[in-house]
């Protein structure tokens, strides 16, 4: 999909999710993003990122892992791991701050 | 047509804790293209942004109200939820959801009005 | 932390007349993560202007915007009935997301 505001070069990234509308998509950047929801197998999808760079500084926990870059189909190759799973005390949050 | 819809209790006791919810319909809450936000407004003030979660549960708040702050997400009944912590009669507003894209904040529900009184 | 300032506090013009709208960021910001707001007393924000200049979905074309760097601008080329309410700017898309504290548009 064309992204309308005025920003740098575009690239070009692999988009693998339910929601992708192709096997590719235009973005700021690629992304990665591996997440386990309660009680699933983990689910990796890839696609583009336009907004919020700051989720792909966030450290890996044992529910999500964000990973970023900014080159042609950068994404296409990359696999993901989860945070061990930690006792319930030690649980990190998923707050990037 | 996406249609956010907040709902919650309409009044709070001081130092309880304000729950409320927000139901995403028409669209879903997984796509990764949009980041669901909450924003108060105190009457007869301006917007103050609290936070925004993501499909994956990744959060950012506002520094603010980090402290007491936290958003929560159920893909699976696509809705997304705030819990504010401790509040007094300073955490009186409306309370707005609304969905961020590359557009800008471009759904937004009607707003809850929420009273911290005893 | 960004903060934006918009100017004036209050702009009391008569329909048909053209507004002009402020908002200065304390630092540099991207033209694509700044936006404009309209709200209606009882109602929730309605998105203006995204990308400093790009119109919403069914904004009508005498609503436009412009600027970069730390000073934007938010212009109605002929107000209507319908203009006369609050407008916010905002910056979006980043780590912290801000508004200003909005200007009041008010009929003459």
């Known amino acids: 999909d064309p992204v309308k505001p005025s920003r740098g070069p575009l690239v070009t990234c692999t988009c693998e999710s339910p929601h992708c509308k192709g096997p590719t998509c235009r973005g700021a950047w690629c992304t990665v993003v591996l997440v386990r929801e309660e009680g699933r197998h983990p689910q990796e999808h890839r696609g583009c990122g336009n907004l919020h760079r700051e989720l792909c500084r966030g450290r890996p926990t044992e529910f999500v892992n964000h990973y970023c870059c900014d080159s042609h189909l950068c994404n296409h190759n990359v696999s993901l791991v989860l945070e061990a799973t930690q006792p319930p005390s030690e649980q990190p949050g998923t707050d990037g701050q | 047509q996406v249609q956010l819809q907040e709902s919650g209790p309409g009044l709070v006791k001081p130092s309880q804790t304000l729950s409320l919810t927000c139901t995403v319909s028409?669209?879903?809450?997984?796509?990764?293209?949009?980041?669901w936000n909450w924003i108060r407004q105190h009457p007869g003030k301006g917007l103050e942004w609290i936070g925004y979660i993501y499909y994956s549960g990744s959060t950012y708040y506002n520094p603010s109200l980090k402290s007491r702050v936290t958003i929560s997400v159920a893909t699976s009944k696509n809705q997304f939820s705030l819990k504010l912590s401790s509040v007094t009669a300073a955490d009186t507003a409306v309370y707005y959801c609304a969905r961020e894209a590359t557009e800008g904040f471009d759904y937004w529900g009607q707003g809850t009005l929420v009273t911290v009184s005893s | 932390e960004i903060v934006l300032t918009q100017s004036p506090g209050t702009l009391s013009l008569s329909p048909g007349e053209r507004a002009t709208l402020s908002c200065r960021a304390s630092q540099s910001v991207s033209t694509t993560y700044l936006a404009w707001y309209q709200q209606k007393p009882g109602q929730a924000p309605r998105l203006l202007i995204y990308?400093?200049?790009s119109r919403a979905t069914g904004i009508p074309d005498r609503f436009s915007g412009s600027g970069s760097g730390t000073d934007f601008t938010l212009t109605i080329s002929r107000l209507e009935p319908e203009d006369f309410a609050l407008y916010y700017c905002?910056?979006?898309?980043?780590?912290?997301?801000?508004f200003g504290q909005g200007t009041r548009l008010e009929i003459k």
């Open positions: 905002q910056h979006y898309g980043t780590s912290s997301i801000t």
């Open positions: 990308g400093a200049s």
């Open positions: 028409g669209g879903s809450i997984s796509s990764g293209d949009y980041y």
